[in-house]
Interface confidence: low
């Protein structure tokens, strides 16, 4: 079943995926699409990586992280309710039918008066076999491409406490990483 | 190696509309996640951060001068183009323009130029 | 918009003298945080990105560091062409914002 994720409109919706490349340069591409994941690719593309840079996106959904270190969690800018439902990460493992895909349902609350960021419990459930790259934030070398910054100012907590170096050794420590190679 | 070079008026008038040209080299907006845009400095003053724009024609504004600020590209020509309304005396300064990688520093600056709003 | 307060904001220095300049966010920005110099009459040049990162062809004299909302960034030896304005700039989020910069002066 997916793992569900919560963010009130206006706010900046943050889905978490992330895989361990077998060295720097050699990336895999990554697609995110809207709705679940079919049996190859992704539907309704909103974001696409490949062996070298980020390939394609639209204007609300960026990657924030390193990208090149295998974070490839989506940020949704200034979420509205049609954008609830389920996203799909697919990391596309070369061979047949290696690919490991995920299903993140995003769930927007409509906003309150004062907004309160919600916490995420049970980290352990945020990271179905997702965790690990050493890598959390801006692109090593800036020579190489990425996305352009996005407005977290109101960015849950879980999000913020994954910037956390401490909190993200603490993840990365606790087991499951996809490793490519 | 990369360039970028602002033109446009040194001198405009209030209430008129400032339109500046930057013309690059070196790179393309065709590249994914590059970015050109615009940052100005008020005499004495520090750096404010207008406008950007990406290859995929996403714009970003100040929230503060959205409503005046308009950026657009002409990626055959390698220019980016700003238009800047209404403009006031508080708008003197320097505008730089400038190039970054996604969500990276701004690593490549035009020489900047000056503009003056005064009647 | 985050803010970045820059100290101090102006000092002055020997050739030769450790230099440090700290810059504050105004909530954590992780490490998108990036240092420029400028000269009068001159655009502004990259440092250090991403707090610690130095940029190619700047020397090793200048390094950075900081996490969350507490950077700083260190002249080593300060040498006669490092007297400048150095501006911190978060790109953490949309708009992107600049220290009000600190002017290093010759004592």
């Known amino acids: 079943s997916e793992v569900e994720y919560r963010a009130e409109v206006g706010q900046n919706a943050y889905l978490p995926c992330f895989y361990t490349p077998a060295a720097p340069g050699n990336l895999v591409p990554v697609c995110w699409g809207k709705g679940a994941c079919p049996v190859f690719e992704c539907g309704n593309v909103v974001l696409r990586t490949d062996e070298r840079d980020v390939n394609y996106w639209t204007s609300r959904y960026w990657l924030n992280g390193d990208f090149r270190k295998g974070d490839v969690s989506l940020t949704i800018e200034n979420v509205t309710l049609a954008d609830s439902g389920i996203y799909c990460c697919r990391i596309q493992i070369p061979g047949i039918m290696n690919d490991e895909k995920f299903n993140l349902k995003l769930v927007i609350k409509p906003a309150k008066v004062t907004p309160a960021p919600t916490r995420q419990r049970d980290f352990t459930a945020a990271f179905p076999r997702m965790l690990t790259t050493r890598g959390h934030g801006p692109a090593e070398t800036q020579t190489l491409g990425s996305l352009p910054d996005i407005n977290l100012t109101q960015i849950s907590t879980l999000a913020n406490e994954l910037r956390d170096s401490r909190l993200a050794n603490d993840l990365r420590d606790s087991g499951a990483t996809i490793r490519i190679g | 190696q990369i360039t970028l070079k602002e033109s446009g008026p040194t001198l405009v008038k209030p209430t008129q509309t400032l339109t500046l040209t930057c013309t690059f080299s070196g790179f393309s907006l065709s590249t994914s996640g590059v970015g050109v845009g615009w940052i100005r400095q008020p005499p004495g003053k520090a750096l404010e951060w207008l406008a950007f724009?990406?290859?995929?024609?996403?714009?970003r504004y100040s929230p503060s001068l959205k409503s005046r600020l308009t950026i657009t590209k002409d990626t055959s020509k390698n220019q980016v183009v700003l238009t800047m309304t209404n403009m006031d005396p508080v708008d003197t300064a320097t505008y730089y323009c400038?190039?970054?990688?996604?969500?990276?520093?701004?690593?490549?600056w035009g020489q900047g130029t000056l503009v003056t709003v005064s009647s | 918009d985050i803010q970045m307060t820059q100290s101090p904001s102006s000092l002055s220095a020997s050739v030769g003298d450790r230099v440090t300049i700290t810059c504050r966010a105004s909530q954590s920005i992780s490490s998108y945080l990036n240092w420029y110099q400028q000269k009068p009459g001159k655009a502004p040049k990259l440092l250090i990105y991403a707090a610690s990162s130095l940029q190619s062809g700047v020397p090793s004299r200048f390094s950075g560091s900081g996490s969350g909302t507490d950077f700083t960034l260190t002249i080593s030896s300060l040498q006669p062409e490092d007297f400048a304005t150095y501006y911190c700039?978060?790109?953490?989020?949309?708009?992107?914002?600049f220290g009000q910069g600190t002017k290093v002066e010759i004592k």
């Open positions: 700039q978060q790109s953490y989020s949309t708009p992107p914002t």
């Open positions: 400038t190039h970054r990688r996604g969500w990276g520093p701004f690593d490549y």
């Open positions: 724009i990406y290859s995929n024609d996403d714009k």
